[in-house]
């Protein structure tokens, strides 16, 4: 099963880029295009992404890139860089050589001996940098998303194929399959692979059935599987919860709308710093939990859980994960206590001593005796206990 994030990924903020870059098989991505399957070609060189040289861009490389990215084949050759010499020859002999010139720290090229990504290699400094870039538009726009899970990193799995979003059947759906989804979306690793009805059922076609990933694939559509069959209904739509998904609970209060603020992130529950816990953050949390608005921010207790989270909201966000956030930074809320909140829907405001039992609670056991409690609320959040 996927292991926790490496140490260099533990300190994270909402402003950082995704944990895994696309195109693991071929170190390539498309940027500034109308979709994830069109745009300027960039190749990865050690830690940076560089635009690929346009002069050496050909139909084989275009085809290989589109296939590697799961975008079908390449569209018309008119999308490629025009076949003309990249630059005119240099000045006549006798003039100063430009060998030591900065232009020689030129652009990399993606060179392919065939239209298959295994036949390609990135060659550094293959072209002089003159601003001409390789571009491609691929024939098939494929994409992946998680829907109705309260954020981009949890929910029902949906694939875009042939211009239509559709579900994946939960037959044989497991952590390895969910791990590929999470990694592809830049959502870390899979915390849970969920069978149907944990999220709202889909409505479109069912694109895949019997998915059987090894966990190493870069894209879900690279995993072995079958086309969606008629006997698979939307009651069997597969779901996933990824480590980068955040869900929240209030503990130690009279009911679920009062208490210490805890966020489930990267597989564990964490406390939240009260040093920056202002009315705007409390308001966003109370509303996202379906608990009305924030009434009070009581004094917190010392941090007791494994990690710490810091939020900074303007008050208009739908959930705390839409706010600016930082996690476990070494200098994070070192002097602070764990944030607490009392929301307007809490029974303690009405002098009622009986704790509220959340409506429609199911408890199910999935994968290695991990208990998942699903609260059938508007936010459809998952609470992993």
């Amino acid at each position: 099963h996927p292991s926790p994030a490496p140490p260099d990924q533990l300190n994270t903020s909402s402003a950082e880029s995704e944990l895994w870059e696309p195109g693991e098989r071929l170190p390539v991505r498309l940027t500034n295009g109308s979709s994830s399957c069109s745009g300027t070609v960039e190749v990865r060189l050690e830690a940076s992404w560089e635009p690929a040289c346009g002069a050496l861009w050909d139909s084989r490389a275009a085809e290989a890139v589109c296939r590697a990215l799961g975008c079908g084949g390449a569209e018309a050759a008119s999308q490629l860089a025009p076949p003309t010499p990249e630059l005119p020859p240099p000045p006549a002999a006798g003039n100063t050589s430009v060998a030591a010139n900065a232009t020689l720290a030129g652009a990399p090229a993606l060179l392919c001996s065939g239209a298959e990504w295994r036949l390609c290699e990135v060659v550094e400094h293959a072209c002089r940098s003159d601003g001409r870039r390789a571009r491609v538009t691929c024939a098939e726009n494929r994409a992946l998303r998680l829907v109705d899970g309260g954020g981009a990193c949890a929910g029902r799995v949906e694939m875009l194929e042939h211009g239509e979003w559709g579900s994946v059947c939960d037959d044989t759906w497991d952590l390895e399959d969910a791990h590929v989804v999470c990694r592809q979306l830049g959502c870390g690793w899979a915390v849970q692979a969920l069978p149907g009805l944990h999220f709202t059922p889909g409505r479109g076609p069912i694109h895949r059935d019997q998915v059987n990933c090894s966990g190493a694939e870069a894209y879900l559509w690279d995993c072995p599987g079958l086309p969606g069959q008629h006997y698979c209904g939307h009651k069997e739509d597969a779901g996933a919860v990824c480590s980068e998904h955040q869900s929240w609970r209030l503990t130690g209060g009279a009911d679920r709308c009062e208490g210490q603020v805890e966020v489930h992130f990267r597989g564990v529950w964490n406390t939240v710093c009260d040093s920056e816990w202002y009315p705007s953050e409390a308001k966003v949390l109370c509303q996202s939990l379906g608990c009305g608005t924030a009434v009070e921010r009581p004094k917190g207790l010392p941090h007791s859980l494994s990690g710490r989270m810091y939020y900074s909201c303007n008050g208009e966000e739908l959930t705390l994960s839409n706010c600016s956030w930082r996690f476990n930074n070494s200098n994070l809320c070192s002097q602070s206590l764990a944030a607490r909140v009392l929301c307007s829907a809490s029974r303690s405001l009405h002098n009622l001593s009986t704790p509220e039992v959340p409506a429609s609670v199911q408890t199910v056991t999935i994968e290695s005796s991990v208990t998942v409690k699903i609260e059938n609320k508007e936010s459809r959040e998952l609470m992993l206990l």
Epitope: A55, P89, G94, S97, E124, R128
Partner: nanobody, 123 residues
Framework: QVQLQESGGGLVQAGGSLRLSCTAS????????LGWFRQGPGKEREFVAA????????YYADSVKGRFTISRDNAKNTLLLQMNSLKPEDTAVYFC????????????????WGKGTQVTVSS
């Protein structure tokens, strides 16, 4: 105008070796990325190997990978192609090429061609 002159071709038995050389008249030799193309009997011209301006990057056709090695000596204005484990299908006229804008992997970026040297590999 850059003049490219190939040498070192000849007749060799399968499994043997040859070393092709290309010299350039141009004093700004190091401004050019260089390479080799070849044209076998009744075949189209095809890419063999290329090297960038300073020699730090090389690229080979799949058919010669592991057998041929391209190198350059900018001080002597010379490009070399060491050909080992030659096969009958390596029989062709070998052309030295120079390109200012990019490594000469595709014909449309090539600025200058040599006249060629014949390599014949007998079985």
């Amino acid at each position: 105008q850059v003049q490219l002159q190939e040498s070192g071709g000849g007749l060799v038995q399968a499994g043997g070796s040859l070393r092709l050389s290309c010299t350039a008249s141009e004093r700004t030799f190091s401004d050019y990325a260089l390479g080799w193309f070849r044209q076998g009997p009744g075949k189209e011209r095809e890419f063999v190997a290329a090297i960038n301006w300073v020699g730090g990057s090389t690229y080979y056709a799949d058919s010669v990978k592991g057998r041929f090695t391209i190198s350059r000596d900018n001080a002597k204005n010379t490009l070399l192609l060491q050909m080992n484990s030659l096969k009958p299908e390596d029989t062709a006229v070998y052309f030295c090429v120079a390109s200012w804008g990019a490594m000469p992997v595709l014909t449309h970026v090539i600025n200058y061609w040599g006249k060629g040297t014949q390599v014949t590999v007998s079985s």
